[in-house]
């Protein structure tokens, strides 16, 4: 089952500005840009063995996340 | 996603090496394509990137001498490096990371640059 | 920059032994509840393959074998059972701001 985007809030860093539901917070430059500029994932297929922890970084709301949290969707944005 | 570098083995001292990656199944308008370098038997070293909106990053130790330019319609990009002396020799590769992580995923086979006269 | 210190330089090893190599860096790496840190996997005449990002996150095709682990500033890139085709040599990376930074490599050899 495909999610959308969950969001990523700092431990050690203040929230970026909060992006839309279109937008991915791109850390490079640190503001939000449309999602399909970055190289966002895609589905793995059924079976893959390995966890596909990807998800769209966009810290409008604080979800808790652990470092590279093994549950975390894959973006619903591609 | 497959990315395939090209460009001449041998550079002369003082010239400009100039190398190519040719990127097939991404569109280089998304994502950030970078270059790393790897010396003969030593490690690697970031030298930069050129992001999906044409902005670019060069690593500070090498700014002064580093061009990392696109063509979209071939959907390659280039590294030109002026004035290199024999510390330049190295295996130059072309990369692009994950998102949100950032991670270089895919890579190409790299290229050898031999500098010397 | 951040600067990646690797240890070992380079070990020797059995097949199926467990090898764990580490990796510190010079400040934090860990941003918006990631840890930006990634291990390769580096052969002879080949370019770099992604073992793990995220700290502990398996790259694709990975074996299962192979996990990493950390925060912060230290990290560990564990082998469970060394396995011929484990002989290489492992970097760390972080890739939280640039320049992206290497450590200076981690070189298993068979013993």
């Known amino acids: 089952m495909r999610r959308g985007p969950r969001s990523l809030r700092g431990r050690d860093a203040p929230a970026p500005t909060p992006c839309v539901p279109a937008e991915c917070f791109d850390l490079l430059v640190r503001h939000c840009v449309a999602c399909g500029l970055l190289r966002t994932p895609r589905p793995k297929p059924a079976g893959a063995s390995s966890p596909a922890p990807r998800t769209a970084l966009q810290p409008q709301e604080s979800v808790g996340a652990g470092a590279g949290e093994a549950a975390l969707p894959l973006p619903g944005l591609l | 996603v497959q990315l395939q570098e090209s460009g001449p083995g041998l550079v002369k001292p003082s010239e400009t090496l100039s190398l190519t990656c040719s990127v097939s199944?991404?569109?280089?308008?998304?994502?950030?394509w970078n270059w790393i370098r790897q010396p003969p038997g030593k490690g690697l070293e970031y030298i930069g990137y050129?992001?999906?909106?044409?902005?670019?990053y060069y690593n500070p130790s090498l700014k002064s001498r580093v061009t990392i330019s696109r063509d979209t319609s071939k959907n390659q990009y280039s590294l030109r490096l002026s004035s290199v002396t024999a510390a330049d020799t190295a295996l130059y590769y072309c990369?692009?990371?994950?998102?949100?992580?950032?991670?270089?995923?895919?890579w190409g086979q790299g290229t050898r640059v031999t500098v010397s006269s | 920059d951040i600067v990646m210190t690797q240890s070992p330089s380079s070990l020797s090893a059995s097949v199926g032994d467990r090898v764990t190599i580490t990796c510190r860096a010079s400040?934090?790496?860990?941003?918006?509840?990631?840890?930006?840190m990634n291990w390769f996997q580096q052969k002879p005449g080949k370019a770099p393959k992604l073992l793990i990002y995220?700290?502990?996150n398996l790259g694709s095709g990975v074996p299962s074998r192979f996990s990493g682990s950390g925060s912060g500033t230290d990290f560990t890139l564990t082998i469970s059972s060394l396995q011929p085709e484990d002989f290489a040599t492992y970097y760390c990376?972080?890739?939280?701001?640039?320049?992206?930074?290497f450590g200076q490599g981690t070189k298993v050899e068979i013993k």
């Open positions: 990369a692009s990371p994950n998102y949100p992580f950032y991670a270089m995923d895919y």
């Open positions: 199944g991404d569109s280089i308008t998304s994502g950030y």
């Open positions: 050129i992001s999906y909106s044409g902005s670019t």
């Open positions: 400040e934090s790496v860990d941003n918006y509840g990631i840890s930006f």
């Open positions: 995220a700290a502990s």
């Open positions: 990376q972080q890739s939280k701001e640039v320049p992206w930074t």
